[in-house]
């Protein structure tokens, strides 16, 4: 969470952003809120990106003003126009690219004053892993697959029964580049699996951490997946 305040001139207003991460090829949200104003026509929202010459997005007098927008953001940005009046300046970014990562500034002008706050936006690829029993293998084997990750993650196996055990010598992980030549498919195989145990395949990079669990008993197989974004802290 980053809270910024206005500077000289008019009164300052509080602007708040939250660090976030975008999944390449999907839509993302850059969060920004501010002290609301009663008149929409008095609110100006400017989104800027460090290292980029043009604006990311501008909203003023109740509508988008995109004459100064940099072409790398052309047709890919939108604010939630109906929520600006209640202090939501968040930006929707369509078709997130790797190069959208960076430091953004949410700059607000209202009749009460000015304010801005920075936001660190990370981009990459992350997806839920699925763990299955590999019946094709010669011994009891688990196969953990996740279709899209970037940057290259680490993969660690754990088990409920053998807590703290190091499975690196009985597992094998590979990374296969996807067709767009950026993201990769993650495949990790765990050998010598015992029955009546719960195994976890944990995939992590600096953007996200995902876990795929599988519980193997004589009577059933239960699966569960979880993904958590690792937001960078305020600085």
């Amino acid at each position: 969470l980053i809270i910024g305040f206005g500077i000289s001139g008019r009164h300052s207003i509080t602007v708040t952003t939250v660090a976030s991460a975008g999944n390449i090829g999907e839509d993302g949200i850059l969060s920004c809120t501010f002290e609301p104003d009663i008149k929409l026509s008095d609110i100006v929202i400017q989104w800027l990106k460090e290292g980029v010459l043009g604006l990311v997005h501008e909203f003023k007098e109740g509508k988008d003003e995109l004459s100064e927008q940099d072409e790398m953001f052309r047709g890919r940005t939108a604010v939630f126009a109906d929520q600006v009046i209640v202090g939501n300046a968040s930006l929707r970014l369509k078709n997130v690219q790797l190069t959208d990562a960076g430091t953004y500034k949410c700059y607000i002008i209202t009749s009460k004053g000015k304010g801005n706050a920075n936001l660190e936006y990370k981009t990459g690829a992350f997806s839920m892993p699925e763990v299955n029993v590999d019946y094709n293998a010669s011994s009891e084997t688990l196969r953990c697959e996740a279709p899209r990750w970037f940057p290259q993650p680490t993969v660690v196996w754990a088990s409920q029964v053998d807590q703290g055990a190091n499975f690196s010598e009985v597992s094998n992980t590979s990374f296969e580049l996807n067709s767009e030549n950026v993201t990769m498919k993650v495949v990790s195989v765990l050998y010598n699996v015992t029955i009546n145990n719960t195994y976890s395949c944990m995939i992590e990079n600096d953007i996200a951490k995902a876990t795929g669990d599988i519980k193997v008993t004589e009577s059933e197989i239960k699966r569960r997946s979880h993904l958590q974004l690792l937001n960078s802290k305020a600085s």
């Epitope: 290292g51 980029v52 043009g54 940099d70 072409e71 790398m72 990562a101």
Partner: antibody, heavy 126, light 113 residues
Amino acid sequence: QVQLQESGPGLVKPSETLSLTCTVSGGSISSSSYYWGWIRQPPGKGLEWIGTIYFSGNTYYNPSLKSRVTISVDTSKSQLSLKLNSVTAADTAVYYCARLRVTMVRGVIIGVFDYWGQGTLVTVSS
Amino acid sequence: DIVMTQSPDSLAVSLGERATINCKSSQSVLYSSNNKNYLAWYQQKPGQPPKLLIYWASTRESGVPDRFSGSGSGTDFTLTISSLQAEDVAVYYCQQYYSTPPTFGQGTKVEIK
């Protein structure tokens, strides 16, 4: 304050490979907001863009040099490097590394150079 | 490639007087969809690397004195130093960033008369 420092041999023989390194300090080369580039300036002449790289490794080269040039990045050392092979006397120049503040025109990443290294003179001679 | 041609090649101006440098591009660097001119100006003092002065043809880089100004559109651009100071002695380059490869003018040397 971002600082860039070029290093490498000052003398290269014709037909050999010119290799230079640029070390970035006061800011991370893996900053996702910036691109990095190489520009050269023959003695007493103007500036020529060689190429540009993003921290992920994406490269953009001047078509006139593309067949001979390789730019790479080592984010762990905060360095970018330039290799120019089959050099001739015409490659004698001061070589600069610089940070690129970008824009996009019709799908092409391009921009202005806002921070420069001091430059290193490379002479091609036997 | 877009060819950038500067004039004059050198210029001698008295201290406190106005210096004007011209830059012409072989094709327009004005992008009609956003009405921006993709042109920058740099200053290079002897033994130093170039320093960014102006981008978008007329936007001054942070920290650049306001005696430096840029103007023009399309193919014809001008860098003006309104009141020449001793520290302004340098070679000045224009650069287009409208199309790849980015290209520079041949430079204009500014001296004190």
